[in-house]
């Protein structure tokens, strides 16, 4: 009869292990070993037992004892099971962000392990498991479909395994993948909105604005605006779920025509944009050309009034005969042009819209000076103590300074109140002198004296 | 222009009769006076003759002083001078026609010295 | 009797420095008052007529105000070359007066 100890074996990969062969008589002719395992024999008194070190054991193995005797050959078998824990434990990538309301298919992948039958692999959300199952094939795959969901956000995916040796008198042995962090956003499908003028003139600044509702979570939200090749620069605001990104644009002269005005809104791994013109244009105000700003009374004076070569003028109300950037018209100066405006105002169509630019010139007519009876009155009578204002008015531009004198040598006070007195009777030689002339005219003042009975 | 000449040296109790000769205008249009001061005294204001050749003076100068005109000059005549007349004397075109160009045609003063 | 008073008959001014030069009229001349700058050796020079109107040529710095019987002559920003004795003259009336002149404001600019 043989026997081996010990009967079953459970060791890690690349262990050794002590096994014992015995028989039952004393003296067998022959006892060994059979396995295919690196052996060494353990040298002990007797003939009856043998010990062997098996060394480097890989995978699962039944070594032999066999032993005869005279009564017969007899063997019998030890049971050595090998564990490892898996070489590879892996989630499949998948892309970081996923949107809502989107499968999300997990799946774990296992190389190696064994015993299989104490190999499980579990898939869990933190440490919340969604799904365990035994490890099959080579390698195992354990797979499961979770519904994206806003409060996934950030939260970590990872696959385990457990190899279970505890009922062998061993541990529990658990190995984890890499996690993969799930971030999960809504873009709607409605493209961002975008206001922004829908034309601008050069060398001036507009504003645009680009906004959009309904996103998930916003702070990660990109927001890329650009005219044509020029990147904007925004300040973004954001509200729970939207934001609204305001930029200045600035045009030049080389930027004149039609421009793609474009926001790219980016989140996750998807986009939406919209795009929209914006007709850049040149347009200076008119010109109003006055052959002289300050002409002497009398004058001719032409007033022209040019614009850009597409634009509609009309000078002063009246529109260009042909219509088209160019009027004019002619004038005799007279006092009554003095301060007068001549307005030209100029009109473009730029992709659809009228543009409207005003330039006002203002004529200067030199006349006079003018001293009339109407404003002067020539003869003045006054009861002697009375108060007077003696009113005299001279015209002309520019203003004309006004003396009036007697003799030379005493004034008589214009727009003053005086008291009347002897010494004021008189003739007085009023001049009023500008740099256009000087006019004069005699102003008589007589002083009633008062009757006595 | 205005200029006046016949300044000098005089002795009290004499007679003077200062000129002013103008040039550019009309004596008819246009009213002179005279005006002097003393050595370290300020301006004083003598006389005037208007245009109609009407003549107004200063209270203490009546009696003491006569202005005539000529058609291109303007005489003062000192009376029975004494030092106190010791001056500078100017004479001024329309000092009370007070446009930008009023008093500002002053001639450039005779000195009168008053002296035994 | 359209007698003149001006004050004060002498003021020391900093160069930079702003003056003041008062002159009362003894009746009202209205707004008839004219102001010179005399230097000694050297014909009086024409400022200001109509109490607050500049005579061309004359710099900024000089200001007149005033009417009635009041009158004000400022210099602002005084020069050294604004050294000199400064008189007002009433311009309303020829008769019946003493002197249309002030007795005369001696500015020292130092």
């Known amino acids: 009869q043989t026997s081996v100890s010990p009967s079953k074996v459970i060791l890690p990969r690349g262990g050794s292990v002590l096994v014992t062969c015995s028989t039952s008589c004393d003296q067998p002719k022959l006892l060994g070993i059979e396995t295919p395992l690196p052996k060494k024999e353990l040298l002990l008194p007797g003939n009856n037992r043998k010990v062997y070190e098996l060394s480097n054991v890989q995978e699962d193995s039944q070594p032999m004892c066999y032993s005869n005797c005279p009564d017969g050959q007899s063997t019998a078998k030890t049971f050595l099971t090998v564990y490892w824990t898996p070489e590879r434990v892996e989630l499949a990538p998948l892309p970081s962000w996923q949107p809502v309301g989107k499968n999300l298919t997990l799946r774990c992948q296992v190389e190696g392990g064994a015993p299989r039958a104490n190999l499980t692999v579990v898939l869990l959300r933190g440490e919340k498991e969604l799904k365990r199952e035994p490890a099959v094939g080579e390698p195992a795959e354990v797979t499961t479909t979770v519904l994206v969901r806003r409060d996934h956000h950030g939260a970590n995916f990872s696959c385990r395994t457990e190899l279970d040796l505890r009922p062998q008198g061993l541990e529990l042995f658990e190995n984890t993948s890499a996690p993969y962090q799930l971030q999960t956003f809504v873009l709607p499908a409605t493209p961002p909105q975008l206001v922004s003028p829908r034309v601008l003139e050069v060398d001036t600044q507009g504003t645009v604005v680009c906004s959009l509702d309904g996103l998930f979570p916003v702070s990660e939200a990109q927001v890329h605006l650009a005219l044509g090749d020029q990147r904007l620069n925004p300040t973004v605001t954001y509200g729970n779920d939207s934001f609204s990104a305001k930029a200045s644009v600035s045009v030049t002269a080389e930027d004149e025509g039609t421009q793609r005005l474009t926001c790219a809104v980016i989140l996750g791994n998807q986009s939406q944009e919209t795009l929209q013109t914006v007709t850049i244009y040149s347009f200076p105000a008119p010109n109003v050309i006055l052959t002289k700003p300050e002409v002497s009374e009398g004058t001719e004076v032409t007033v022209k009034c040019e614009a850009h070569p597409r634009a509609k003028v009309t000078l002063n109300g009246v529109p260009a005969q042909p219509l088209g950037p160019r009027a004019q018209l002619l004038l005799k100066a007279t006092p009554e042009d003095n301060g007068r405006s001549f307005s030209c105002s100029a009109t473009l169509e730029v992709a659809g819209q009228l543009i409207h630019k005003n330039q006002t010139r203002e004529l200067r007519v030199l006349y006079g000076p003018r001293l009339d009876e109407r404003d002067c009155p020539g003869n003045w009578t006054w009861p002697e103590n009375s108060q007077q204002t003696p009113m005299c008015q001279a015209w002309g531009n520019p203003l004309p300074e006004l003396k009036c004198l007697k003799d030379g040598t005493f004034p008589l006070p214009i727009g003053e109140s005086v008291t009347v007195t002897r010494d004021l009777e008189g003739t007085y030689l009023c001049r009023a002198r500008s740099t256009q002339g000087e006019v004069t005219r005699k102003v008589t003042v007589n002083v009633l004296s008062p009757r006595y009975e | 222009s205005v200029e006046e000449s016949g300044g000098g040296l005089v002795k009290p109790g004499g007679t003077l009769t200062l000129t002013c000769t103008v040039s550019?205008?009309?004596?008819?249009?246009?009213?002179m006076g005279w005006v002097r001061q003393a050595p370290g005294k300020g301006l004083e204001y003598i006389g005037i003759?208007?245009?109609?050749?009407r003549t107004y003076y200063a209270s203490w100068a009546k009696g003491r002083f006569t202005i005539s005109k000529t058609s291109t000059t303007v005489d003062l005549k000192i009376t029975s001078p004494t030092t106190e007349d010791t001056a500078t004397y100017f004479c001024v075109r329309d000092p009370y026609d007070s446009y930008d160009d009023g008093y500002r045609l002053w001639g450039p003063g005779t000195l009168v010295t008053v002296s035994s | 009797a359209y007698d003149m008073t001006q004050t004060p008959a002498s003021v020391e001014v900093a160069v930079g420095g702003t003056v003041t030069i008062k002159c009362q009229a003894s009746?009202?001349?209205?707004?008839?008052l004219s102001w010179y700058q005399k230097k000694p050796g050297q014909r009086p020079k024409f400022l200001i007529y109509?109490?607050?109107k500049l005579a061309s040529g004359v710099p900024s710095r000089f200001e007149g105000s005033g009417s009635g019987t009041e009158f004000t002559l400022t210099i602002s920003g005084a020069q050294s070359d604004d050294a000199a004795t400064y008189y007002c003259q009433q311009a309303y009336s020829s008769g019946s007066i003493d002197n249309a002149f002030g007795g005369g404001t001696e500015v020292v600019v130092k």
């Open positions: 550019g205008f009309s004596l008819s249009s246009h009213a």
């Open positions: 109509d109490a607050s």
């Open positions: 003759i208007g245009s109609s050749d």
């Open positions: 009746q009202s001349i209205y707004r008839y």
